[in-house]
């Protein structure tokens, strides 16, 4: 299918939203039970909807 | 400018077979997850599968699941539906879309953030 | 599967007023719900992902909150662009279910 496979990794099942461990550029995407290639998150200083675009800032302020 | 662009749709009778394809610009699709949804004539979205083509996982919704197979070649950028054994309920707009994923502790928190222009699957005798 | 059950199915509004759509999530799935905006004949467009976060280029009149079960949109001050149907998503687990969407029409 040309799919190339990049790096060894659990698949998890489809319930479990444990995240694996992923590399730096990466984050574990529950959805699809991998890790995937992560942008920047942004976090307003007021912890509500903003209107930054994302990657502006770099802390999250609480987990998803 | 990142772009999806579907084809491949058409007319088809039921117990027919249909490939549709998701060509991609832009951006590598092998570093996202790439999802089919679907939407009957004035009805709601429904997803249909998604694939993660650096990995090659794949997973389909019940109502497709068995007919359809969903993948992707990373040397063309382009992601595919096959559909075979088609019903007239699968008649609808299939769209393609990306899934953006943003860093939040290590935890995707996306949504699907661009659409291709959807091509018309009709399933008809 | 996880249901997204989206209320009012529609609603009558008018160019400057306040609109909230709900979501209602049949479990928990944290902050994972998205929010979309679909126009007759086009593809949809993210607005809010995360529960809460503004994408990309949206104006600030829409917002998203909740967690849990129940969710939030606002449009602050509609404007006549904004008649359209809008659709939640949560995507903590496949299948990513949708809402039944919200279809904003004009008084």
């Known amino acids: 299918m040309g799919a190339r496979r990049l790096r060894v990794r659990s698949q998890r099942s489809r319930d479990s939203s444990v995240p694996t461990q992923c590399n730096q550029t990466e984050c574990f995407d529950p959805l699809v039970r991998n890790c995937v290639s992560c942008e920047l998150f942004h976090t307003p200083d007021t912890g509500h909807t903003s209107s930054l675009e994302p990657g502006t800032a770099l802390q999250p302020q609480e987990g998803s | 400018e990142v772009q999806l662009v579907e084809s491949g749709g058409g007319l088809v009778q039921p117990g027919g077979s249909l490939r549709l394809s998701c060509a991609a610009s832009g951006f590598t699709i092998s570093s996202n997850s790439i999802h089919w949804v679907r939407q009957a004539p004035g009805k709601g979205l429904e997803w249909v599968a998604w694939v993660t083509p650096g990995v090659g996982s794949t997973d389909y919704a019940d109502s497709v699941k068995g007919r359809f197979t969903i993948s992707a070649d990373t040397s063309k950028n382009t992601a595919y539906l096959q559909m075979n054994s088609l019903r007239a309920e699968d008649t609808a707009v299939y769209y393609c879309?990306?899934?953006?994923?943003?860093?939040?502790?290590?935890?995707?928190?996306?949504?699907?953030?661009?659409w291709g222009q959807g091509t018309l699957v009709t399933v008809s005798s | 599967d996880i249901q997204m059950t989206q209320s009012p199915s529609s609603l009558s509004a008018s160019v400057g007023d306040r609109v909230t759509i709900t979501c209602r999530a049949s479990q928990d799935v944290s902050t994972a719900v998205a929010w979309y905006q679909q126009k007759p004949g086009k593809a949809p467009k993210l607005l809010i992902y995360s529960a809460s976060f503004l994408y990309s280029g949206v104006p600030s009149r829409f917002s998203g909150s909740g967690s849990g079960t129940d969710f939030t949109l606002t449009i602050s001050s509609l404007q006549p662009e904004d008649f359209a149907t809008y659709y939640c998503q949560q995507s903590l687990m496949t299948p990513p279910t949708f809402g039944q969407g919200t279809k904003v029409e004009i008084k």
């Open positions: 879309a990306r899934r953006v994923c943003y860093n939040r502790l290590g935890v995707c928190a996306g949504g699907m953030d661009y």
